[in-house]
Amino acid sequence: MMTGTIETTGNISAKKGGSVILQCHLSSTMAQVTQVNWEQHDHSLLAIRNAELGWHIYPAFKDRVAPGPGLGLTLQSLTMNDTGEYFCTYHTYPDGTYRGRIFLEVLESSVAEHSARFQIP
């Protein structure tokens, strides 16, 4: 039985050219996290964090994705095309798979403030 919940940074906004932290957190379960996958809205994998092998950043994102903090991901040099949904998929044993969603809006405005708060979607 899957008892866990995924908390995410929810809906966030950040400036074009800036950076943003995508963060998910799995709670309320004792399941072992074996792998975390980070994906973009168009089904492209940004990164995988395997419990034994560590981080792998996918080729298309090597120049502007940094692993961490923790199991999160830092997306740098933001463009307007980065606006959209991001998904964290937690592969766990014995529970199975948990999935969280974050919506990122990249703003042209120089007054755009990075807003992020933890919430349960």
Epitope: T34, Q35, N37, E39, H43, S44, L45, I48, N50, A51, E52, L53, G54, H56, Y58, P59, H91, T97
Partner: antibody
Framework: DVQLQESGPGLVKPSQSLSLTCTVT?????????WNWIRQFPGNKLEWMGY???????RSNPSLKSRISITRDTSKNQFFLQLNSMTAEDTATYYC?????????????WGQGTSVTVSS | DIVMTQSHKFMSTSVGDRVSITCKAS??????VAWYQQKPGQSPKLLIY???YRYTGVPDRFTGSGSGTDFTFTISSVQAEDLAVYYC?????????FGGGTKLEIK
């Protein structure tokens, strides 16, 4: 140049254990790779069996979990497969393979394979 | 486990032809797919990683595409030396699993 070479018995009796060795040359098994065992059954089906990481931690296919052990000897740059309670269904060609973690995240090095038959 | 299905066990083609081999995942695997070539009597060799990236030294006649559950491996102009079995493999989650293979036969 990185090379992997499997060695071990070609014939195993039912209920006995299979022990295979993979010797890696040209690269340290403590650097940046997952070192895998994969087998290919008659008819060509490929099955990933498990790996030992560069740090020494392991992960294996749940279908083999109770029977498989993957270990290593860093001083000899070798890693090992032990598969217990062998049956005729374990007859296959066994490959060791290097899974590159940083750039490709795929099996970019393979040994030449060693054929194992389970028969009395 | 994620099942990778290559619907064609055999494909027959001629030198110079374009051929596409398909692979379908039983569930979403994003772009976590590699393609391998296995020539008779040899071990598999990595051709494509991350669904669409050519491995070092692989000729540009080999391409990969797809995401989600549907993937395609294409040889733009088949050469005689391309006679082999081609396998897809997913690494979206362990256990890593392979397709059943597609044997390319040259007419």
């Amino acid at each position: 140049d990185v090379q992997l070479q499997e060695s071990g018995p070609g014939l195993v009796k039912p209920s006995q254990s299979l022990s295979l060795t993979c010797t890696v040359t040209g690269y340290s098994i403590t650097s940046d790779y997952a070192w895998n065992w994969i087998r290919q059954f008659p008819g060509n089906k490929l099955e990933w069996m498990g790996y030992i990481s560069y740090s020494g931690s392991t992960r294996s296919n749940p279908s083999l979990k109770s029977r498989i052990s993957i270990t290593r000897d860093t001083s000899k740059n070798q890693f090992f497969l032990q598969l217990n309670s062998m049956t005729a269904e374990d007859t296959a060609t066994y490959y060791c393979g290097g899974w590159e973690v940083r750039n490709y995240y795929a099996m970019d090095y393979w040994g030449q394979g060693t054929s194992v038959t389970v028969s009395s | 486990d994620i099942v990778m299905t290559q619907s064609h066990k055999f494909m027959s083609t001629s030198v110079g032809d374009r051929v596409s081999i398909t692979c379908k995942a039983s569930q979403h695997v994003s772009t976590a797919v590699a393609w391998y070539q296995q020539k008779p009597g040899q071990s598999p060799k990595l051709l494509i990683y991350s669904a669409s990236y050519r491995y070092t030294g692989v000729p540009d006649r080999f391409t990969g595409s797809g995401s989600g559950t549907d993937f395609t491996f294409t040889i733009s102009s088949v050469q005689a030396e391309d006679l082999a079995v081609y396998y897809c493999q997913q690494h979206y989650n362990t256990p890593w699993t392979f397709g059943g293979g597609t044997k390319l036969e040259i007419k």
